[in-house]
Interface confidence: low
């Protein structure tokens, strides 16, 4: 491998000791709590509720719940935690994914069940974009082997 | 309560540095994009730098660029700018302030005036 | 570099009456998020700045309902629907899009 290859993985290590994913583990698994307990346990259910989360074209805001505003101040500070700590690895698409994949790997074993799961990933792969960050392309969220794809 | 506390500005000869301060408290300093913005009286507010949570990613306006520094000590809750070659056309109040953790600038502190004169 | 464009760049008032403020960009402002990354603060004299609006459209906890943002892509508006004493100073907006860039201001002043 070529040397710059291999400086860039130490520095993405380093990058990644350094950083603290449990804001963003905390915010994901409120967030689809939040989601079952507006959905029932089947996160698919469609709602013909106008402003259900899945209308609500806030849900969709990188700054929703606002820190601006008190109503769930819990998960807006754990997003806004999360989404400073994603912003280390901004101008590294490959370590961003690493990101993703650590806190998926943290989480995966207190996911309750394969639809939990996918819901999970599902908001996983959207939290870069949710702050305001580019995602990253290729991203292989899958915990089951350790012979995943990093790019 | 949020206090943004900046020091370090004074008079300055052309070509000379100096280091601005700002100290924090009654926030997560460390959870917080920081910002120095600057206001002069012709040119109004002009975002000067900002660093990020950590420190990894720093972004510098075009007309500093290669000239001033931002840094932030994490222990000490302080951030830093490190003004070098410094022009006429620098002299200003210079605020920082705490992002709200996307990109609004949410807290600012009450500036430091720094004059570059001859 | 994007940059944003103010005007008026001075805007007499008379309390009670609406004041209106326009920011143009000179490249769209749409995140791919969907959301445009322009914010209004106002610097009262003596004082430092205060965010008064962010995305363009969403109001900073504790400025008053009369303040209000509107806008999309390249052009953008601040209004306030009934200006008071204590809203002169100079208004600004700011793009967050790539880095940061602030307008020239608008001077806003009773009659």
């Known amino acids: 491998r070529q040397q710059w290859e291999l400086q860039g993985d130490r520095r993405c290590q380093s990058q990644l000791e350094r950083a603290n994913l449990r804001p963003c583990e905390q915010h994901l698994m409120q967030k689809i709590q939040r989601d079952e307990d507006s959905y029932g346990r089947d996160p698919y259910s469609p709602s013909q509720d106008p402003y259900s989360p899945s209308q609500d074209p806030d849900r969709r805001d990188p700054y929703s719940p606002s820190p601006y505003d008190r109503r769930g101040a819990g998960s807006s500070q754990h997003q806004e935690r999360c989404c400073n700590e994603l912003n280390e690895f901004e101008n590294n698409q490959r370590c961003m994914c690493e990101a993703l994949q650590q806190i998926m790997e943290n989480q995966s074993d207190r996911l309750q069940g394969r639809q939990q799961e996918q819901q999970f990933k599902r908001e996983l792969r959207n939290l870069p974009q949710q702050c305001g960050l580019r995602a990253p392309q290729r991203c292989d969220l899958e915990v089951e082997s350790g012979g995943r794809d990093r790019y | 309560q949020v206090q943004l506390v900046e020091s370090g500005g004074g008079v300055v000869q052309p070509g000379r540095s100096l280091r601005l301060s700002c100290a924090a408290s009654g926030i997560a300093f460390n959870d917080y994009t920081m910002h120095w913005v600057r206001r002069s009286p012709d040119k109004g507010l002009e975002w000067v730098a900002a660093i990020s949570y950590g420190g990894t990613n720093k972004y510098y306006a075009d007309s500093v660029k290669g000239r001033f520094t931002i840094s932030r000590d994490s222990s000490k809750n302080t951030l830093f700018l490190q003004m070098d070659s410094l022009r006429v056309e620098d002299t200003a109040v210079y605020y920082c302030a705490r992002d709200s953790g996307y990109r609004s600038l949410l807290h600012w502190g009450q500036g430091t005036l720094v004059t570059v004169s001859s | 570099e994007i940059v944003l464009t103010q005007s008026p760049l001075s805007l007499p008032v008379t309390p009670g009456e609406p004041a209106s403020i326009s920011c143009r960009s000179s490249?769209?402002?749409?995140?791919?998020?969907?959301?445009?990354?322009l914010d209004w603060y106002l610097q009262k004299p003596g004082q430092s700045p205060q965010l008064l609006i962010y995305?363009?459209?969403k109001r900073a906890s504790g400025v008053p309902d009369r303040f209000s943002g509107s806008g999309s892509g390249t052009e953008f508006t601040l209004k306030i629907s009934r200006v008071e004493a204590e809203d002169v100073g100079i208004y600004y907006c700011m793009q967050a899009l790539q880095t940061w860039t602030f307008g020239q201001g608008t001077k806003v002043e009773v009659n």
């Open positions: 995305m363009a459209s």
């Open positions: 490249q769209s402002l749409v995140h791919r998020n969907g959301y445009n990354y």
